[in-house]
């Protein structure tokens, strides 16, 4: 299982190794170094993968990660059972689908072993960490002489997400996008005959059942038109 | 070096309302997970409101539906809107902070945060 471990995106107040909590003084206040962000993504509603930078302990440390869900059925606290490892180090947790409840405020809780007081409790909104697969299956088709309309399937519910498409020709340097809602179709209204199209596709879940920010990777592009463009020197840049 | 400063504390009778602010200076909250926390005397902080810097925001059980949280970027200040106040508010509320780099994270575990103000006190009289 290859897994892809989140860094932090260069936010300076995160680079200290340790701090002094300032905390009020009536409080149990200890200095005590900060564990890393859990950071969670759900794909495709299949399985979920929570991680942190393991990196970023002082010296290597088997964290242990327990969950729950809040007010639900679901809140009895349980432990990871099936841990991601980085260099033999804990570095997240995989949940498989019957364990992901995407409704429910989901809690995670990071815990140093070595020193149980050393841990830090997240909450989180899967519904709001959900990205699908890619498209598949795109095909296009003509309405008219002059009008293309481009096809996708998704491997969910489709009214659940919204879609990106972009297109451009041989002779384009960038790419134009439309946003698609649910219906998971786009139609091209005037096409020329003479350059070759090139079609893609990334879908994102969001508004109507999450509020995702994260897109699915792009789809496979798809290509309509004429072959022959001998003085296009953007076709190797699609076909790569 | 962030510096947060409550205001809006008080004494205020059962089934009222108060608004608590709470001011940072030294550096924009905008990427900052932040809390509200309260300590009643005897008692173990807890947390009130917390909230993710991309907008999720979590409420503890006993006051979901009477308090709400709001930011204001602009400003670097964020509040606390307590309505219908119950003897059982009574409490010191402290304001908190924490950098994170997701914009998915919310701690309601206090020693998770780096920054807080010194308190306020808010007082709900039956």
């Known amino acids: 299982l290859n897994t892809t471990i989140l860094t932090p995106n260069g936010n300076e107040d995160t680079t200290a190794d340790f701090f002094l909590t300032t905390m009020p003084t009536d409080s149990l206040s200890v200095s005590t170094l900060p564990l890393p962000e859990v950071q969670c993504f759900v794909f495709n509603v299949e399985y979920m993968n929570c991680t942190w930078n393991s990196s970023s302990e002082p010296q290597p440390t088997n964290l242990t990660l327990h969950y729950w869900y809040k007010n639900s059925d679901n809140d009895k606290v349980q432990k990871c059972s099936h841990y991601l490892f980085s260099e033999e180090i804990t570095s997240g947790c995989q949940l498989q689908k019957k364990e992901i409840h995407l409704y429910q405020t989901f809690v995670v809780q990071l815990q140093d072993p070595r020193e149980p007081r050393r841990q830090a409790t997240q909450m989180l909104k899967l519904q709001n960490l959900v990205i699908p697969w890619a498209p598949e299956n795109l095909t296009l088709h003509k309405l008219s002489e002059s009008q293309l309309e481009l096809n996708w399937n998704n491997r969910f519910l489709n009214h659940c997400l919204e879609h990106l498409v972009q297109y451009r020709t041989d002779w384009d340097h960038s790419w134009t996008e439309q946003s698609v809602d649910y219906r998971h179709k786009f139609s091209l209204p005037s096409v020329d005959g003479q350059k070759r199209y090139t079609f893609r596709v990334r879908s994102r879940f969001n508004p109507l059942c999450g509020s995702a920010q994260h897109w699915s990777e792009w789809s496979h592009p798809i290509h309509w038109g004429s072959n022959t463009s001998k003085e296009n020197p953007f076709l190797f840049a699609l076909e790569a | 070096e962030v510096q947060l400063v409550e205001s809006g504390g008080g004494l205020v009778q059962a089934g009222g309302s108060l608004r608590l602010s709470c001011a940072a200076s030294?550096?924009?909250?905008?990427?900052?997970?932040m809390g509200w926390f309260r300590q009643a005397p005897g008692k173990e902080r807890e947390y009130v409101a917390i909230d993710s810097w991309g907008g999720d925001t979590f409420y503890a059980d006993s006051v979901e539906g009477r308090f709400t949280f709001s930011r204001d970027n602009a400003k670097n200040e964020v509040y606390l809107q307590m309505n219908s106040l119950q003897p059982e508010d009574t409490a010191v509320y402290y304001c908190?902070?924490?950098?994170?780099?997701?914009?998915?994270?919310?701690?309601?575990?206090?020693?998770?945060?780096?920054?807080w103000g010194q308190g306020t006190q808010v007082t709900v009289s039956s």
């Open positions: 908190a902070g924490a950098p994170t780099s997701f914009a998915t994270t919310a701690y309601s575990s206090s020693n998770s945060y780096r920054y």
């Open positions: 030294g550096r924009t909250l905008s990427r900052y997970a």
